[in-house]
């Protein structure tokens, strides 16, 4: 059967059931995707506009495919296997009463099953499997995939990367030369490159092999761990650091007062809740903000977003995307994009990838 031929998969909730709070729907769907990402290399991200790989729809009766719903009971939901268009989409019967608990029909449990189909799984004959064709409530707090579910999904996608399976529970220093190492954010700061991961950053001084690891809090005690995006405007000695919907300004390596501020002051629409990566290009005096599978371009002189954005990353950065973890600018012509444990040297003048590297290639591993 079909499978997704990529590991970054986007989903979008088209509309919400009135049976539940929107936040509870978001949470149930997010946790359902997490069930599958925990046992595979797949990464799921929610987008709020544009074309997602997997569209989540609540509908009743005839709703745009051949498989009309049948009212309360009976068919609860259905999902299409991987593919373009309707491929991957998951439809939930609005005539059911969707809940967060054992009453009605539990959305999380149903979504885990349907997302299994969205990823290419068929039904299981094991009654303990979530992919068994009939719905049965189990305690969602202790819910686990069966061995059969795990075998099935890993036969399609493999098992998770080491750094996913071992999520650094005690926040100990990540192994710098782990081939699966990924970064949260990367930026130049003068002649140095800062690589952020969890509560740490590595400092790489250009052209020198030595790298040092530091706690973010040791340099900037007022900043949080888990920085998600960063960029530098070298001419102003400014570094911008992002986490969730907030950003901090660092001037001459010192945090500015009156921060953090909301990312929406840059002009992002309300649905943008966090920035994945950011990079400033001094040639154009523009900053590129990457959010899920899209990017915005910000004019640092006029202090406003350029019109015509967001655009799809894959459309305008050939071979990059659909989603990235980090990016920085170097040598006057390259962006270095990070996707998981891989890194791509991208010549923005030629508009193509010129080298593929491991993310930790800067450290002489």
């Amino acid at each position: 059967g079909p499978v997704w031929r990529k590991h970054y998969i986007t989903y979008r909730i088209n509309n919400y059931t009135p049976d539940m709070n929107r936040e509870d729907v978001d949470y149930a769907i997010r946790k359902a995707f997490q069930v599958w990402s925990n046992v595979t290399p797949l990464k799921f991200s929610k987008i709020n506009t544009g074309m997602a790989d997997i569209l989540v729809v609540f509908a009743r009766g005839a709703h745009g495919d051949f498989h009309a719903f049948d009212g309360k009971g009976g068919i609860l939901a259905h999902a299409f296997g991987p593919g373009s268009g309707i491929g991957g989409d998951a439809h939930f019967d609005e005539d059911e009463f969707w809940t967060t608990h054992s009453g009605g029909t539990n959305l999380f449990l149903t979504a885990v099953h349907e997302i299994g189909h969205s990823l290419g799984l068929g039904h299981s004959s094991d009654p303990k499997a979530v992919m068994f064709p009939t719905y049965k409530y189990v305690d969602i707090n202790t819910f686990r995939l069966s061995a059969d579910d795990i075998r099935g999904i890993q036969s399609l996608y493999g098992d998770p990367k080491e750094n996913q399976r071992l999520p650094n529970p005690d926040n100990s220093e990540p192994a710098l030369c782990d081939p699966n190492l990924s970064f949260d954010a990367v930026t130049t700061v003068g002649n140095k490159i800062f690589f952020f991961k969890d509560r740490f950053f590595w400092l790489k001084v250009s052209e020198r092999p030595k790298t040092s690891v530091n706690l973010i809090s040791s340099l900037w005690p007022t900043l949080p761990s888990g920085i998600e995006a960063a960029y530098e405007i070298e001419a102003r000695n400014q570094v911008f650091l992002f986490k969730d919907d907030k950003y901090w300004l660092i001037s001459n390596l010192r945090p500015e007062p009156n921060y953090p501020k909301s990312i929406h002051s840059f002009g992002f629409p309300n649905f943008v809740k966090k920035i994945d990566a950011a990079v400033f290009n001094p040639r154009f005096y523009r900053t590129y903000f990457f959010v899920d599978n899209q990017y915005w371009r910000y004019d640092e002189r006029r202090q406003m977003m350029d019109p015509g954005y967001p655009k799809l990353i894959t459309k305008n950065f050939q071979g990059i995307g659909p989603k990235i973890d980090a990016v920085f600018y170097s040598k006057n012509k390259y962006y270095y994009f990070f996707q998981g444990s891989n890194q791509f040297e991208y010549d923005f003048l030629l508009q193509r990838i010129t080298k593929t590297l491991k993310s930790n290639s800067w450290f002489g591993c």
């Epitope: 059967g1 079909p2 088209n14 074309m51 569209l55 729809v57 709703h63 745009g64 495919d65 051949f66 498989h67 259905h78 999902a79 299409f80 296997g81 593919g83 373009s84 268009g85 309707i86 491929g87 989409d89 189909h117 068929g122």
Partner: antibody, heavy 122, light 103 residues
Framework: EVQLLESGGGLVQPGGSLRLSCAAS????????MHWVRQAPGKGLEWVSG????????FYADSIKGRFTISRDNSKNTLYLQMNSLRAEDTAVYYC???????????????WGRGTLVTVSS | DIQMTQSPSSLSASVGDRVTITCRAN??????LNWYQQKPGKAPELLIY???SLQSGVPSRFSGSGSGTDFTLTISSLQPEDFATYYC?????FGQGTKLEIK
Amino acid sequence: EVQLLESGGGLVQPGGSLRLSCAASGFTFSPYWMHWVRQAPGKGLEWVSGIGPSGGPTFYADSIKGRFTISRDNSKNTLYLQMNSLRAEDTAVYYCAKDIRGAYSGGLFDYWGRGTLVTVSS
Amino acid sequence: DIQMTQSPSSLSASVGDRVTITCRANQSIYTYLNWYQQKPGKAPELLIYAASSLQSGVPSRFSGSGSGTDFTLTISSLQPEDFATYYCQQAGIFGQGTKLEIK
């Protein structure tokens, strides 16, 4: 190269029966939904019926429900449409169409046959 | 039940013109809309699926847009071979068709 070749059309009297066949080649037939779509002379396209990969489920347009039966033989890579109680308004070119999907059908037809003409007239 | 309304039913245009055909559903069909081209005596051919995705081999002058209930097919610069009938379709429902003729 994907090919769909319809046969079995012809002239039949009202109330009569015909069985259309569609021979598929150039792709693995069994995983895909298959459909019949018709077009009356000088008119638009009308979806008639669809069938799932293993012979079910089956769906029918209201206009032919109870009179036509869709079936398939995956071992022969062939789709069928049994048409009973034919009426003058069933006169049309009947096309066989391959769906892009298996499991569930979204109704996206990526390949079509050339059609076979069914004429219902006394 | 879902219904599709296509307009106009016929259209006269010249080579090089930009042409737009619209299709409206009576309820949301998300992006589950396809467009087909049919020439006289031939079977229909898939042009665009999922509202805006160009089928492999179809010239880039064809484009589709829309979601929910309103959709459009645009031909940016008509070529002689584009004079045909165009149908929108969603699952088992086709629009009435738009016949595109030479002016």
